[in-house]
Amino acid sequence: ELCDDDPPEIPHATFKAMAYKEGTMLNCECKRGFRRIKSGSLYMLCTGNSSHSSWDNQCQCTSSATRNTTKQVTPQPEEQKERKTTEMQSPMQPVDQASLPGHCREPPPWENEATERIYHFVVGQMVYYQCVQGYRALHRGPAESVCKMTHGKTRWTQPQLICTGEMETSQFPGEEKPQASPEGRPESETSCLVTTTDFQIQTEMAATMETSIFTTEYQ
C-alpha cells in the first residue's frame, strides 16, 4: 500500500530513509538536457523474497539532443558533485541489508540522474530527521516518522524534533539529561488498530545521527 502523502517536514531539518521497504518506487528522473531512454523504465522498484531484496529495473538517461541510447555507468566525481542526493557518511550507513529483511539499500546513482530523487513510499516505511547545519535540537523526541495505515487511510506520524537556531537556551540546574525513551507512544493513543513498522531496530541509530549529512529529497 503506497503512502498518500510525503513525510512531514520539520522546520530547519532534513530527513532520510536508512533503507526502503519492498514496494517502494523511485522515479527514473534525468537531469536537464537528458531524458529516459525510449525503452527505459519509468521507475525502480524494491522487490524481493524472504531472504533478499533488491531494486528491479535500471534507470537510464540519454541526451535529449541525440537518439542513441546511453550506457549505464556510475557518475564521475565531478558529476557526483552536482547531485543533491548524498549518501550517508560511512559510520552512519544503514544496518547491513541482510539484517533488514524486506528492505532495499539506497540505490546507486545512475549517469545523468536528476538532482532530486522522488520516492513513493509504502506503509511501514520509516524516515529519520536531523537538524540542518546551523541549527541544533532543542528537543529530540522520536526523530523519525512512520507511514501507518489508520482507519483505512495512510498517515505519517509527527516527528517530535524541534530545531532551533538560538544558542542561548536555559537549562535548569541540578537536572541530568535523561535518556530518550525508545518505546515511543503507547497503543492507548490510537483509537483503532494501526499498521506498524518492522523497522524499529534503526531507532538507536537515529539518536546518533547528529553529525551525518543527508539531503536526499523525497516525494
Epitope: R140, G141, I162, T164, Q171, P186
Partner: antibody, heavy 115, light 107 residues
Framework: QVQLVQSGAEVKKPGASVKVSCKGS????????MHWVRQAPGQGLEWMGV????????IYAQKFQGRVTMTVDTSTSTAYMELSSLRSEDTAVYYC????????WGQGTTVTVSS | DIQMTQSPSSLSASVGDRVTITCRAS??????LEWYQQKPGKAPKLLIY???TLAEGVPSRFSGSGSGTDFTLTISSLQPEDFATYYC?????????FGQGTKLEIK
C-alpha cells in the same frame, strides 16, 4: 489515554511569584516537548515558551525573558512554569500543551493577580 | 517575530453553511501551521496540523489548505457544535505566534 492535568487556581499579590504544574500521563513524557500558552480574560492565545522534557533546555518568548522559568521533573512526568514579579496584566488562564503541534492541552490554570 | 493575521475577526453563519477562515503570515512559513478550536471556558483543541492534516478524531467536514503565507480553514457544512473561536498558529520558529482569533457565531 493522553492527559495533561494542571494544578488548581491561584490568587497572588502584585510582585509575588506563581508556579503552575502540568502532569502528563498516557504517553512517554520525555518524547514530547512542553509549551506554555496563556490567555488573558477575553483575549487571544499568547505563546510563552517551550521546554524540552528530554534535556531541560527551554526557550522563552522575549516578553517573558527574565520573569519566567520552565522546568521538568521526569520522575513524576511533570512540567512547571514559574512566573515572577507578577502584575495585574498577568491575570490569565495558563495552559500547557504537548509536542510540536500542540496536540493535547491541559485544562488550564487560572491565575489572578490582585492587591 | 512572525505576525499571524486572521480574517474575519468574527463571522455569523447558519447550520449547514460552508465557512472559510483565512490566516496570513507576515513571512513564508511553508506548511508549518496549525488550526485550533476553542469553546468558552475550555482549552483549545487541535483541528489541523501542518496546514492540511486532519488531527485524530476531528470530523472530515474540517479541512485546511495553503502554503507559504496564505492559509485557509474550511468547514464544509456547519454543525451546531462548531460555533466557537478559531485560532491559527505557526511553528516555523520561536516565538510560535497565534492569530488573533475568529469568533464564529450563530446567525
Amino acid at each position: 489515554q493522553v492527559q495533561l492535568v494542571q494544578s488548581g487556581a491561584e490568587v497572588k499579590k502584585p510582585g509575588a511569584s506563581v508556579k503552575v504544574s502540568c502532569k502528563g500521563s498516557g504517553y512517554t513524557f520525555t518524547d514530547y516537548a512542553m509549551h506554555w500558552v496563556r490567555q488573558a480574560p477575553g483575549q487571544g492565545l499568547e505563546w510563552m515558551g517551550v521546554i524540552s522534557t528530554y534535556s531541560g533546555d527551554a526557550i522563552y518568548a522575549q516578553k517573558f525573558q527574565g520573569r519566567v522559568t520552565m522546568t521538568v521533573d521526569t520522575s513524576t512526568s511533570t512540567a512547571y512554569m514559574e512566573l515572577s514579579s507578577l502584575r495585574s496584566e498577568d491575570t490569565a488562564v495558563y495552559y500547557c500543551a504537548r509536542g510540536v503541534t500542540f496536540d493535547y492541552w491541559g485544562q488550564g490554570t487560572t491565575v489572578t493577580v490582585s492587591s | 517575530d512572525i505576525q499571524m493575521t486572521q480574517s474575519p475577526s468574527s463571522l455569523s453563519a447558519s447550520v449547514g453553511d460552508r465557512v472559510t477562515i483565512t490566516c496570513r503570515a507576515s513571512q513564508d512559513i511553508s506548511n508549518y501551521l496549525e488550526w485550533y478550536q476553542q469553546k468558552p471556558g475550555k482549552a483549545p483543541k487541535l483541528l489541523i496540523y501542518n496546514a492540511k492534516t486532519l488531527a485524530e478524531g476531528v470530523p472530515s467536514r474540517f479541512s485546511g489548505s495553503g502554503s507559504g503565507t496564505d492559509f485557509t480553514l474550511t468547514i464544509s457544512s456547519l454543525q451546531p457544535e462548531d460555533f466557537a473561536t478559531y485560532y491559527c498558529q505557526h511553528h516555523y520558529d520561536t516565538p510560535y505566534t497565534f492569530g488573533q482569533g475568529t469568533k464564529l457565531e450563530i446567525k
